[in-house]
């Protein structure tokens, strides 16, 4: 029957690499959107530019990076999309009014150590978590 | 000396509540932006609408939710911002051309169980991670 044929056809389109979401028939090819896909970009943050130079002793700044780009249907595997993002992308593709596209955000962040004066003028060396983008993905 | 006095005066302006990022003088008040702040919104995803009804047996759909809203300066503590997002917000506030605002994305996700036919027509019950948004934040 047409119904079962359609089902079998639908299933055959599902990705073989089904770790992220077995049920997402989201093609593993390049994004159809013209904007650049979600990825990590260069960003050097100068503590002086932030107005923090008077209490941060070191470093002078750091390579923070940032995430930007499209999370459009279909999502590629390198976009580190969560299962929810895969579903949201599909919902947006079917009806853009319903939900926005998922957003390009850090998926892995690293820490940096900062030497600074505290409010009592004591010198503190502290590790600040989640300061440097290591990888971006669609969330 | 004048230099150290100035430094000490500047330091006294840094925030007292410095859990998220000790060095961020990001005010704990409501966003100056007129758009609604980053938060969780309702979204019911019907597997039929996604074209998956022929191989997903159950459930018929699920409450997925989604994240949307502004991540503008200054970030409030309830926005679950990472240290990187706090820095990025400040960089954007100082120079909007440099980087975009951080984006509103899931910070906590839950799993759901799905019963479906695999490619060999076997019935599989599988727990899919990261399917339901539990909380949103600025990333």
């Amino acid at each position: 029957s047409t119904g079962s044929k359609q089902r079998s056809q639908n299933r055959s389109k599902t990705p073989k690499n089904q770790e992220a979401l077995r049920m997402a028939n989201v093609a593993e090819n390049s994004s159809s959107d013209q904007r650049q896909a979600c990825k990590k970009h260069e960003l050097y943050v100068s503590f002086r530019d932030l107005g923090w130079q008077d209490w941060i002793i070191a470093p002078e700044g750091y390579a923070a990076y940032y995430c930007e780009g499209e999370c459009a249907f279909p999502l590629n595997s390198y976009m580190n999309a969560t299962n929810h993002a895969i579903v949201q992308t599909l919902v947006h593709f079917i009806n853009p009014e319903t939900v926005p596209k998922p957003c390009c955000a850090p998926t892995q962040l690293n820490a940096i150590s900062v030497l600074y004066f505290d409010d009592s003028s004591n010198v503190i060396l502290k590790k600040y978590r989640n300061m440097v983008v290591r990888a971006c993905g669609c969330h | 000396s004048t230099g150290s006095k100035q430094r000490s005066q500047n330091r006294s302006k840094t925030p007292k509540n410095q859990e998220a990022l000790r060095m961020a003088n990001v005010a704990e008040n409501s966003s100056s932006d007129q758009r609604q702040a980053c938060k969780k919104h309702e979204l019911y995803v019907s597997f039929r609408d996604l074209g998956w009804q022929d191989w997903i047996i159950a459930p018929e759909g699920y409450a997925a939710y989604y994240c949307e809203g502004e991540c503008a300066f200054p970030l409030n503590s309830y926005m679950n911002a990472t240290n990187h997002a706090i820095v990025q917000t400040l960089v954007h506030f100082i120079n909007p051309e440099t980087v975009p605002k951080p984006c509103c994305a899931p910070t906590q996700l839950n799993a759901i169980s799905v019963l479906y036919f695999d490619d060999s027509s076997n019935v599989i019950l599988k727990k899919y991670r990261n399917m339901v948004v539990r909380a949103c934040g600025c990333h």
Partner: antibody
Amino acid sequence: QVQLQESGPGLVKPSETLSLTCTVSGDSISSYYWSWIRQPPGKGLEWIGYIYYSGSTRYNPPLKSRVTISVDTSKNQFSLKLSSVTAADTAVYYCARICSSTSCWGWFDPWGQGTLVTVSS
Amino acid sequence: EIVLTQSPGTLSLSPGERATLSCRASQSVSSSYLAWYQQKPGQAPRLLIYGASSRATGIPDRFSGSGSGTDFTLTISRLEPEDFAVYYCQQYGSSPLTFGGGTKVEIK
């Protein structure tokens, strides 16, 4: 308590289309899978196919080219059409409900009382 | 498709005796997705067991199911006169859903 009742002609001519309807009472047809099963006289049970209330179907491969199952939620009914029948399609035809959740799936309960359809000229 | 073979074809026993019915699958039935039904002459089948071992609502506790993979068993601990009937196993772990050929439990 949910009850199922099959209805339709008891005699169908060879090469014609067998048409049966199952009326569901005591519960909504929504949120369940609804199935047809047949049993030739003195033989075992054969699953024909099912339909979900929203319209998605699955059929038994040997029969799928001849079978159509449809649903009418407004009447709380689902139907079976089996085309190009032969004497081998003579059987008692049962309708039954399949539970549909991640913890409840695949068994038939309850069943209709069945209706005998004879294929003969 | 998964082929279910039931044995014996006929089981002749007396009331009060223990009945052991076997259902063997041609390949493993995932998650023990197996059900048992009882059918009396002129009646529709009635669900006894689902999930290989869970009794359906209203089924007496003398009926029990066991097994996994390819070998399943329905046991009736003490046969009552109303238990003499045909019993079918059915798998729902793979499509198409299939039934065994049945075991007839008759009075000896």
